[in-house]
Interface confidence: medium
């Protein structure tokens, strides 16, 4: 079963593809923004900022929701899927 | 109660180094990253950066680059900041805030350090 | 980076006045906005997020508009307490970057 917590994060202007690492390996920060303004993606509160957010899980935003949850791997849980059950 | 309580007022000389503190408490320390923001006595606010209690991951604006560094203690939930080769363009009062999750928005501050730096 | 240009930098308003700062970003931000008020001696206090939205518990007087590059920030009718030190802060790129601010006094 995959558990879905709910937070919210502030979307950042990166353009790396969605967090779906599975973690706890953590993604290098990105390089400098902003160098091509034009055709800018939607910006993804995944990248940057909070691309490490989601520690045992996949990262999601919903953007009418203005939300990211933490889509979490089995066993784990908690807001940043950082909790493991002890099932 | 969620509170951000910073360290006191400092005092040091050119070319010295201190540390600021800001301790969290009333919530889950590791799950809100903390942000630091300078304020130059009657001018404005500049970001300096952020730190993922978590990972301990920080990110700095370029100008702090080299002069601030940002750590954190989970143990402890607090949350540190560096500042070396101290001049007195660095005298400024110090903030550390808190981002919300859910509106995400600087909910809390902490109350500010001011940094004096003179000989 | 991007720069905040916020206007007035000080101004004078009598009680019950509306009151309009503006604030002008160098590029367009996307509405990634907030709205901060600053007493003397206090620490900041965020009063609107996403460019119009409005934090919880902040009196419905204040309110915030505008998209691209262009916002502001209104209060429908001053009161005595709305005093202080008021800045904008864009959150659309790094580093996060805030306007000079501006000083409102009452008359």
């Known amino acids: 079963s995959v558990r879905v917590e709910q937070v919210v994060k502030p979307p950042q202007n990166k353009t790396e593809s969605e967090n779906t690492s599975d973690k706890p390996k953590r993604k290098k920060k990105g390089g400098k923004n902003g160098k091509n303004r034009r055709n800018r993606k939607k910006k993804n509160p995944c990248n940057a900022e909070f691309q490490n957010f989601c520690i045992h899980g996949e990262c999601k935003y919903i953007e009418h929701l203005e939300a990211v949850t933490c889509k979490c791997q089995q066993e784990y849980f908690g807001e940043r899927c950082g909790e493991k059950s002890m099932k | 109660e969620i509170q951000l309580q910073q360290s006191g007022p400092e005092l040091v000389k050119p070319g010295a180094s201190v540390k600021v503190s800001c301790k969290a408490s009333g919530y889950a320390f590791t799950n809100y990253n903390m942000y630091w923001v300078k304020q130059s006595h009657g001018k404005s606010l500049e970001w300096i950066g952020y730190?993922?209690?978590?990972?301990?991951?920080?990110g700095y604006s370029q100008k702090f680059k080299g002069k601030a560094t940002l750590t954190v203690d989970k143990s402890s939930s607090t949350a540190y900041m560096h500042l070396n080769s101290l001049t007195s363009e660095d005298s400024a009062v110090y903030y550390c805030?808190?981002?919300?999750?859910?509106?995400?928005?600087?909910?809390?501050w902490g109350q500010g350090t001011t940094l004096t730096v003179s000989s | 980076d991007i720069k905040m240009t916020q206007s007035p930098s000080s101004m004078y308003a009598s009680l019950g006045e509306r009151v309009t700062i503006t604030c002008k970003a160098s590029q367009d931000i996307n509405s990634y906005l907030s709205w901060f008020q600053q007493k003397p001696g206090k620490s900041p206090k965020t009063l609107i997020y996403?460019?119009?939205r409005l934090v919880d518990g902040v009196p419905s007087r204040f309110s915030g508009s505008g998209s691209g590059q262009d916002y502001s920030l209104t209060i429908s009718s001053l009161e005595y307490e709305d005093m202080g030190i008021y800045y904008c802060?864009?959150?659309?790129?790094?580093?996060?970057?805030f306007g000079g601010g501006t000083k409102l006094e009452i008359k």
């Open positions: 805030a808190r981002r919300g999750n859910f509106p995400y928005y600087f909910d809390y």
């Open positions: 802060l864009q959150y659309d790129e790094f580093p996060y970057t």
């Open positions: 996403r460019a119009n």
């Open positions: 730190i993922d209690p978590y990972y301990g991951d920080p």
